[in-house]
Interface confidence: low
């Protein structure tokens, strides 16, 4: 089965490669802003989820991780770091998220809005292709 | 530096290895065979850093370590003495090792657990 290779080039040391994306799954905790800055320093961004099973390689749901969603007062909407809008199908409860909060997510598909000053683990994502 | 890897689709890459993230449960012996059929080996733990990473993302799963009896040393399937601590239960018949969020533990080889496979690039 190993001959069925992915066409993607692999990721930096200590990053996880999965479906042509690279993920840095932190073991330390930072505030949302600190997490965002760290990801940027690694030429990546806080996780932007394409679908609810994007992290299905993570079977443990013991940790919540900051992801790259924040509320835009200008657009009165939750936006990913690249400016795209949050799909209502991803988190059915997003309308009740408090605009001042940031979003933490775990691999079970749970999303929480928490104070952005709370320290959580975080996931950075880089797309290879 | 980046290098181009050769992992099958739907496997993950991490630090020069490919990992198959299993969802199904098997006994330890069945897990060995399942990984062999995927041209890979049952999950092995090479260092503390890898163990820390795996315990963060995985639930309890078999690793490639066993012993013949409670009087024998823990060895890998390659026959090498296993150097990391395996927390042992009170049960003498627990002769296979599993990765757990709290570290490595012994368990009954015939019990069904999630398994993961690994292939070094």
């Amino acid at each position: 089965e190993l001959q069925k290779d992915s066409d993607c080039c692999s990721c930096h040391e200590k990053w996880v490669g999965y479906r042509c994306n690279c993920y840095f799954i932190s073991s330390e905790e930072k505030t949302w802003n600190e997490s965002r800055h760290f990801c940027a320093s690694q030429k990546s961004s806080l996780l932007q989820l394409q679908n609810r099973d994007e992290l299905d390689f993570m079977s443990s749901s013991q940790h919540f991780y900051w992801i790259g969603l924040s509320y835009s007062e200008e657009h009165t909407a939750w936006l990913w770091e690249n400016g795209s809008a949050l799909s209502q199908y991803l988190f059915p409860s997003f309308e009740t998220f408090k605009p001042k909060n940031c979003i933490a997510y775990n691999s079970k598909g749970n999303a929480l809005d928490e104070s952005c000053e709370t320290k959580n683990r975080y996931i950075c994502k880089q797309q290879l292709i | 530096a980046r290098h181009c890897g050769h992992c099958p689709e739907e496997w993950i890459t991490y630090s020069n290895s490919c990992y198959y993230i299993g969802k199904e449960k098997r006994t330890w012996a069945e897990s060995l065979l399942a990984c062999t059929s995927k041209n890979s080996s049952l999950l092995s733990i090479d260092n503390e850093e890898e163990m820390k990473f795996l315990t963060a993302i995985l639930t309890s799963s078999w690793i490639d370590v066993f012993r013949d009896s409670s009087h024998h040393p823990w060895v890998t399937i390659n026959g090498l003495t296993f150097k990391h601590e395996i927390k042992e239960s009170d049960h003498a018949e627990h002769n296979c090792a599993m990765l757990h969020v709290r570290g490595l533990f012994s368990d009954e080889c015939g019990s069904s657990k999630i398994y993961h496979c690994k292939h070094k690039l």
Epitope: Q62, P92, S93, E95, T96 | T59, S60, V101
Partner: antibody
Framework: QVTLRESGPALVKPTQTLTLTCTFS??????????VSWIRQPPGKALEWLAL???????YYSTSLQTRLTISKDTSKNQVVLTMTNMDPVDTATYYC???????????????WGQGTMVTVSS | DIVMTQSPDSLSVSLGERATINCKSS????????????LAWYQQKPGQPPKLLIY???TRKSGVPDRFSGSGSGTDFTLTISSLQAEDVAVYYC?????????FGPGTKVDIK
């Protein structure tokens, strides 16, 4: 029959660490999908969830108290232990442990509770 | 975290009459993949631990009298006691278990008018 029983000191001094033990019978935390939580209730006030540990040793903590709490289990003794550091008089409460199941998605409700143990924090 | 609110704070109802308690969550507790509402109701009598009455918003726990019923979906939920009995005097709490933070409401005290 499933039962849970909390034990620990009735009185602790401010700044001390509280250690509470939940001893249970009728189920095992080595069984898939079973979990134990700690919940507290200050006198005359509402319930507050503190922490949960499941069969897989996954742990969850209250956001506001996560820096002070540690939950662990001893499967062979059928016990779950909660430690809470830097105790303060506002932590005076009845502390309960309760069982829950993770059968359909995240986790289920707390179906069986212990009787609770009253902890007073005072110098 | 999800915030749970309950109304009213307290409720006095005549024996045999209907008692209705409302619970609101600050975000939806409906889990899309199984279409279940992760909301429970508990009854707590003085000096006793809470007792689970209703889970999945509307499923009665085995052994709970059928005068207790739960309804609602998403963010708004109701516990109804169709015919109040003396032994129903207690504080009633709603709780969400969607978020892995297991937040409780502040409670509603029910007594007899």
């Amino acid at each position: 029959q499933v039962t849970l029983r909390e034990s620990g000191p009735a009185l602790v001094k401010p700044t001390q660490t509280l250690t509470l033990t939940c001893t249970f019978s009728g189920f095992s935390l080595s069984t898939s999908d079973l979990c134990v939580s700690w919940i507290r209730q200050p006198p005359g006030k509402a319930l507050e969830w503190l922490a949960l540990i499941d069969w897989n040793d996954d742990k969850y903590y209250s956001t506001s108290l996560q820096t002070r709490l540690t939950i662990s289990k001893d499967t062979s003794k059928n016990q779950v232990v909660l430690t809470m550091t830097n105790m303060d008089p506002v932590d005076t409460a009845t502390y309960y442990c309760a069982r829950t199941i993770a059968a359909a998605g995240p986790y289920d409700a707390f179906d069986i509770w212990g009787q609770g143990t009253m902890v007073t924090v005072s110098s | 975290d999800i915030v749970m609110t309950q109304s009213p704070d307290s409720l006095s109802v005549s024996l045999g009459e209907r008692a209705t308690i409302n619970c609101k969550s600050s975000q939806s507790v409906l889990y899309g993949s199984n279409n279940k509402n992760y909301l429970a109701w508990y009854q707590q009598k003085p000096g006793q631990p809470p007792k689970l009455l209703i889970y999945w918003a509307s499923t009665r726990k085995s052994g709970v009298p059928d005068r207790f019923s739960g309804s609602g979906s998403g963010t708004d939920f109701t516990l109804t006691i169709s015919s109040l009995q003396a032994e129903d005097v207690a504080v009633y709490y709603c709780q969400e278990y969607y978020s892995l933070r297991f937040t409780f409401g502040p409670g509603t005290k029910v007594d007899i008018k």
